[in-house]
């Protein structure tokens, strides 16, 4: 018998090497049983985790899962750090893993860094 | 049941390259990371690097980063593992291993792939 | 880099004994999400390695109840509670924590 907990699907320590002026998207999959949660994109400072309140999201439905999609329209050189979606369902708190952003300023697409680059400098987060 | 099946023993010569393979079964990939272990004959494991199939993105021990590229085609559940400019020290059986992204409830590896270099 | 240290380098102990193996990290292996990311592998003579413990504690699918892991921080401890033939191998701990990932040096379980 499956769980009708909510589950929150980011991979624990993924990551996301993306190009400063490209759309992105960063995708919360979320599986629930009878009424959607309320969920919420947050971005990490230190320990905590500051809510983006003022920020373009929306739902993706597919047959067995939810995606719960923050927009960013463009990707900007401060989008670069640690995210985290937050589901409150029954009145407890579910968070995801964090998933981080590793941002790229912009460049001729001949120079743009491959991803194996993008893995060797995790310092770009800093 | 999550398997890995890895490609066959190889013997190259020094400053060959070579590819090798890792298909996995019984679980979607891109729910998982795959990564890659040397292990020189009697001795210990070395982790060499990840990969997320579902996006690409690697990580790799700086005493590989340079010298192996890893890579996977999501579309047929499978990873690989580059290694250029091949050396006699390059002696060893590698593994592949498989584990779940999220809770790390399973953790499978791969029968392991012989590479030979020798002039 | 993460260092992870085993003792003993090799372990002789009758079937039937309790057999104990320790792995100390450099650094603590406590996650920010609260987690402790040790696991224990068994290889033995010409297979590959087999995950036994994860989280520091819990048994993978199918591993004998023999097996146990504990440990906290820094130090952990892989106990077997009475070997079995089929349990001589090396071991191995492995840390899940940070960047790169690293392996104890192995402990070889030997019959005395």
């Known amino acids: 018998k499956e769980s009708c907990d909510v589950q929150l699907y980011i991979k624990r320590q993924s990551e996301h090497s993306i190009l400063a002026g490209d759309p992105f998207e960063l995708e919360c999959p979320v599986k629930y049983c009878a009424n959607r949660p309320h969920v919420t994109w947050c971005k990490l400072n230190g320990t905590t985790c500051v809510k983006l309140e003022d920020r373009q999201t929306s739902w993706k439905e597919e047959k067995n899962i939810s995606f719960f999609i923050l927009h960013f329209e463009p990707v900007l050189p401060n989008d670069n750090g640690s995210y985290r979606c937050s589901a409150n369902f029954q009145s407890n708190l579910i968070e995801s893993h964090s998933t981080t952003l590793y941002v790229t300023d912009v460049k001729s697409a001949s120079e743009r860094p491959s991803k194996d680059e993008m893995a060797s400098r995790p310092w770009l987060l800093y | 049941e999550v398997q890995l099946v890895q490609s066959g023993a190889e013997v190259k010569k020094p400053g060959e390259s070579l590819k090798i393979s890792c298909k996995g079964s019984?679980?979607?990939?891109?729910?998982?990371?795959m990564y890659w272990v040397r292990q020189m004959p009697g001795k210990g494991l070395e982790w060499i690097g990840r990969?997320?199939?579902?996006?690409?993105?690697?990580r790799y021990s700086p005493s590989f980063q340079g010298q192996v590229t890893i890579s996977a085609d999501k579309s047929i559940s499978t990873a690989y593992l580059q290694l250029s400019s091949l050396k006699a020290s390059d002696t060893a059986m590698y593994y592949c291993?498989?584990?779940?992204?999220?809770?790390?409830?399973?953790?499978?590896w791969g029968q392991g792939t012989l590479v030979t270099v020798s002039s | 880099e993460i260092v992870l240290t085993q003792s003993p380098g090799t372990l002789s102990v009758s079937p039937g004994e309790r057999a104990t193996i320790s792995c100390r990290s450099s650094?603590?292996?406590?996650?920010?999400?609260?987690?402790?990311?040790l696991n224990w592998l068994q290889q033995k003579p010409g297979q590959a390695p087999r995950r036994l413990i994860y989280?520091?504690?819990k048994r993978d699918t199918g591993v004998p109840d023999r097996f146990s892991g504990s440990g906290s921080g820094t130090d952990f401890t892989l106990t077997i509670s009475r070997v079995e033939p089929e349990d001589f191998a090396v071991y191995y701990c492995?840390?899940?924590?940070?960047?790169?990932?690293?392996f104890g040096q192995g402990t070889k379980l030997e019959i005395k």
């Open positions: 291993a498989v584990y779940d992204g999220y809770y790390e409830s399973f953790d499978v």
């Open positions: 019984g679980v979607n990939i891109k729910d998982t990371y």
């Open positions: 990969i997320d199939p579902a996006n690409g993105y690697t």
């Open positions: 650094q603590s292996l406590l996650d920010s999400d609260g987690k402790t990311y």
């Open positions: 989280l520091v504690s």
């Open positions: 492995w840390q899940g924590t940070l960047f790169p990932r690293t």
